[in-house]
């Protein structure tokens, strides 16, 4: 008789999760010479230890501490790009602008990007059937706590001018409940960060509105200003042209506003 298993509302652990994490770690450390000293088996052991045999609604940041420590790396603190609800463009940007980094350009972010995982209390099994959904089940689940932990540390490390890419097509361009709005904004260090510069990415080709005047952007400006960090905002009217101009900045069409 099969043992009763908790049914959660979210998708189960990504198939071949252990193999994927280990393979990503090996690939990352091969591509990034400064991370060659990292023992990927230890990284996997730390990752696994954070959620295996634990109730998937009772995960804490402390559970991820060994992984955070083993995966710590040097990222230029003045080259950090945060994003909210516009991951693909942010990643396309850092693939071209190689000296800038999103969280997913770091080892820990790269390992977990687009993956789901959870275990079960008191068994060493990984749950491939279902995992807790943040809204319907619980917020202290393995995936949510992981991203909260790495996002906090990433924001804490930032300095000078920090950039954030925001999706101008959404009803809430700045969403207080996003990881950026609930974690990263509050963990920028005012003694290190001088300015937060928002890039609002427009969706429609004919959209010429100044989305920097959007009420949610004003709300972001207020939160940032209260934290003694300066705020600036730029409209990116043509994201396709924006990327093209990052690739070829000397192109004559790149002097006009994008």
């Amino acid at each position: 008789v099969p043992r009763w298993r908790q049914q959660w509302s979210g998708p189960g652990t990504t198939k071949r999760f252990p193999e994927t994490v280990l393979a990503r770690c090996v690939k990352y450390t091969e591509i990034h010479p400064e991370m060659r000293h990292v023992d990927c088996q230890s990284v996997w052991d730390a990752f696994k230890g954070a959620f295996i045999s634990k109730h998937p609604c009772n995960i804490t940041e402390e559970d991820y501490q060994p992984l955070m420590k083993l995966g710590t790396q040097t990222v230029p603190c003045n080259k950090i790009l945060l994003w909210s609800r516009i991951k693909d463009l942010a990643h396309q940007f850092t693939q071209v602008q190689r000296d800038m980094f999103t969280l997913e350009d770091t080892l820990l972010g790269y390992l977990a990007d687009d993956l789901t995982w959870c275990g079960e209390f008191n068994t060493s099994k990984i749950n491939y059937q279902s995992c807790p959904d943040w809204r319907k089940d619980c917020s202290n689940n393995p995936v949510s706590v992981f991203w909260k932990t790495v996002s906090r540390r990433f924001a804490e490390a930032a300095c000078d001018v920090v950039h954030v890419m925001l999706n101008g097509s959404r009803s809430k361009i700045f969403d207080k409940n996003s990881t950026f709005g609930s974690v990263e904004v509050h963990n920028l260090q005012p003694e290190k960060v001088q300015t937060l510069e928002a890039w609002v990415i427009h969706g429609g080709r004919e959209d010429s509105r100044d989305l920097c005047q959007d009420p949610t952007i004003k709300e972001l400006e207020s939160i940032i200003s209260k934290r003694n960090i300066q705020f600036s905002c730029k409209n990116i009217y043509r994201p396709d042209k924006f990327l093209q101009c990052v690739k070829n900045p000397e192109d004559s069409s790149c002097t006009s506003e994008i």
């Epitope: 400064e34 991370m35 000293h37 023992d39 230890s42 052991d45 730390a46 230890g49 402390e62 501490q65 060994p66 420590k69 083993l70 710590t72 790396q73 040097t74 990222v75 603190c77 540390r153 804490e156 490390a157």
Partner: antibody, heavy 117, light 107 residues
Framework: QVQLVQSGAEVKKPGSSVKVSCKAS????????IEWVRQAPGQGLEWMGD????????DYNEKFKGRVTITADESTSTAYMELSSLRSEDTAVYYC??????????WGQGTLVTVSS | DIQMTQSPSSLSASVGDRVTITCSAS??????LGWYQQKPGKAPKLLIY???NLHTGVPSRFSGSGSGTDFTLTISSLQPEDFATYYC?????????FGQGTKVEIK
């Protein structure tokens, strides 16, 4: 080969501060955590805190929060541990060590700090 | 804080003896345990990391085992240079904590 060389012995008055240095060589300084551990005379080992020199990440033992500051100078591959508001029970040998797989693989020779009026 | 309890606190043994030291953690520390040897007036030296991995240059007579809460350091055949104090240390969570030490003395 990996080496951690610490500054010399210090005698300090109660209430003052001490700053111990730890110069690293033989590896990439910015890629590894530096741990600080102390040992009072005839006693066991006590972890104080650590730093990741490449990113400036620090973590401290709550017992020393507010009294200990750990810093690092990448240009000289040197880590520092400063302990303030010294009291007689801070008399100990202070060690730096390099972090490896959540253990400490290479240690400095130790710095004796004596707190006495 | 995670408490690390070593036993015994001291032991007397002869050259050639098999010696076992145990370390118990007050909560699950997975495999994040190190073992150190310290001689009087010297800095500790890492013997074993990640519960069972032998550190570079450490003789193979030293071995470690265990995971979760219970760990063991074994010296298969005690040598004269092995008389020292041995400490375990957990790296699972801050603050890192050490056992109180086990002194291995000559019988």
């Amino acid at each position: 080969q990996v080496q951690l060389v610490q500054s010399g012995a210090e005698v300090k008055k109660p209430g003052s501060s001490v700053k111990v240095s730890c110069k690293a060589s033989g590896y990439t300084f910015t890629n590894h955590w530096i741990e600080w551990v102390r040992q009072a005379p005839g006693q066991g080992l006590e972890w104080m805190g650590d730093i990741f020199p490449g990113g400036g990440y620090t973590d401290y033992n709550e017992k020393f929060k507010g009294r200990v500051t750990i810093t690092a100078d990448e240009s000289t591959s040197t880590a520092y541990m400063e302990l303030s508001s010294l009291r007689s029970e801070d008399t100990a040998v202070y060690y730096c060590a390099r972090g490896r797989d959540l253990a400490m693989d290479y240690w400095g020779q130790g710095t004796l700090v004596t707190v006495s009026s | 804080d995670i408490q690390m309890t070593q036993s015994p606190s001291s032991l007397s043994a002869s050259v050639g003896d098999r010696v076992t030291i145990t370390c118990s953690a007050s909560q699950n520390i997975n495999v994040w345990l190190g073992w150190y040897q310290q001689k009087p007036g010297k800095a500790p030296k890492l013997l074993i990391y990640k519960a069972s991995n032998l550190h570079t240059g450490v003789p193979s007579r030293f071995s470690g085992s265990g995971s979760g809460t219970d760990f063991t350091l074994t010296i298969s055949s005690l040598q004269p240079e092995d008389f020292a104090t041995y400490y375990c240390q957990q790296g699972q969570s801050y603050p890192y904590t050490f056992g109180q030490g086990t002194k291995v003395e000559i019988k």
